[in-house]
Amino acid sequence: SPYSSDTTPCCFAYIARPLPRAHIKEYFYTSGKCSNPAVVFVTRKNRQVCANPEKKWVREYINSLEMS
């Protein structure tokens, strides 16, 4: 999960494995102030998971979320 510092969530590690696409309802990018660029996926249970924006599955999920 992202770590919040002064209301700015940042990620310090990325999940490696793909999350089930059907479990993800939305996403957001962490702030440019964070040391690591990251995508945060929000699951249907409102859990937040940090992911590496350079990973193929992450880019694929972002594209499909944008289209839906």
Partner: antibody, heavy 119, light 108 residues
Framework: QVQLVQSGAEVKKPGASVKVSCKVS????????MHWVRQAPGKGLEWMGG????????IYAQKFQGRVTMTEDTSTDTAYMELSSLRSEDTAVYYC????????????WGQGTTVTVSS | SYVLTQPPSVSVAPGQTARITCGGN??????VHWYQQKPGQAPVLVVY???DRPSGIPERFSGSNSGNTATLTISRVEAGDEADYYC???????????FGGGTKLTVL
């Protein structure tokens, strides 16, 4: 170092159920997604399903939906896979395999459990 | 669901290079993992995310992924490399892990 130790071989009659266990040592079960993969004699690997810790849910391969149940006992760091309504085509080696949080791919795997379905 | 196609067998002489392919529709858009399975043993991950190697896996094992084909390359093949090799991808349309049918590598 993570190690997975599975229960011993089973012989079952058609229509029965089998429950295979997989004990994790070296780490706690909650640090991993546990998956189950089977391999029929002389055939390839077939993914059956696995646990998604980030959502606390288990996903199953469509082929096994309704016939397989995967559970975990975190107090003993043991995962279980139960397959019901067994038929001869279910004769296979069943593997548990971990999907570590920060490393892609399934690694390591259990040693495998042979399940034979025969009347 | 997503289908991965592997040749059933590949033969190579010791010291030569073995190439094992894994075909899939636009597979370059997916991360491919490769497993080695020796007779009577559980599979072992040898390459992940197309071309990365887990610690302990020799540099002789490498991977690539382009277009509709991913390739596992084993250079300077040794007798101990004789095994079945499986590719694997995540299919986000079904939320399933998918394995290729496997390739038996024979060292002549």
């Amino acid at each position: 170092q993570v190690q997975l130790v599975q229960s011993g071989a089973e012989v079952k009659k058609p229509g029965a159920s089998v429950k295979v266990s997989c004990k994790v040592s070296g780490y706690t079960l909650t640090e991993f997604a546990m998956h189950w993969v089977r391999q029929a004699p002389g055939k390839g690997l077939e993914w059956m399903g696995g646990f998604v810790p980030e959502d606390g849910e288990t996903i199953y391969a469509q082929k096994f939906q309704g016939r397989v149940t995967m559970t975990e006992d975190t107090s003993t760091d043991t995962a279980y896979m139960e397959l019901s309504s067994l038929r001869s085509e279910d004769t296979a080696v069943y593997y548990c395999a971990t999907d570590p949080l920060y490393t892609p791919g399934l690694e390591p795997w259990g040693q495998g459990t042979t399940v034979t379905v025969s009347s | 669901s997503y289908v991965l196609t592997q040749p059933p067998s590949v033969s190579v002489a010791p010291g030569q290079t073995a190439r094992i392919t894994c075909g899939g529709n636009n597979i370059e858009s997916k991360s491919v993992h490769w497993y080695q399975q020796k007779p009577g043993q559980a599979p072992v991950l040898v390459v992940y995310d197309d071309s990365d190697r887990p610690s302990g896996i020799p540099e002789r094992f490498s991977g690539s992924n382009s277009g509709n084909t991913a390739t596992l390359t084993i250079s300077r093949v040794e007798a101990g490399d004789e095994a079945d090799y499986y590719c694997q991808v995540w299919d986000s349309n079904t939320d399933h892990w998918v394995f290729g049918g496997g390739t038996k590598l024979t060292v002549l």
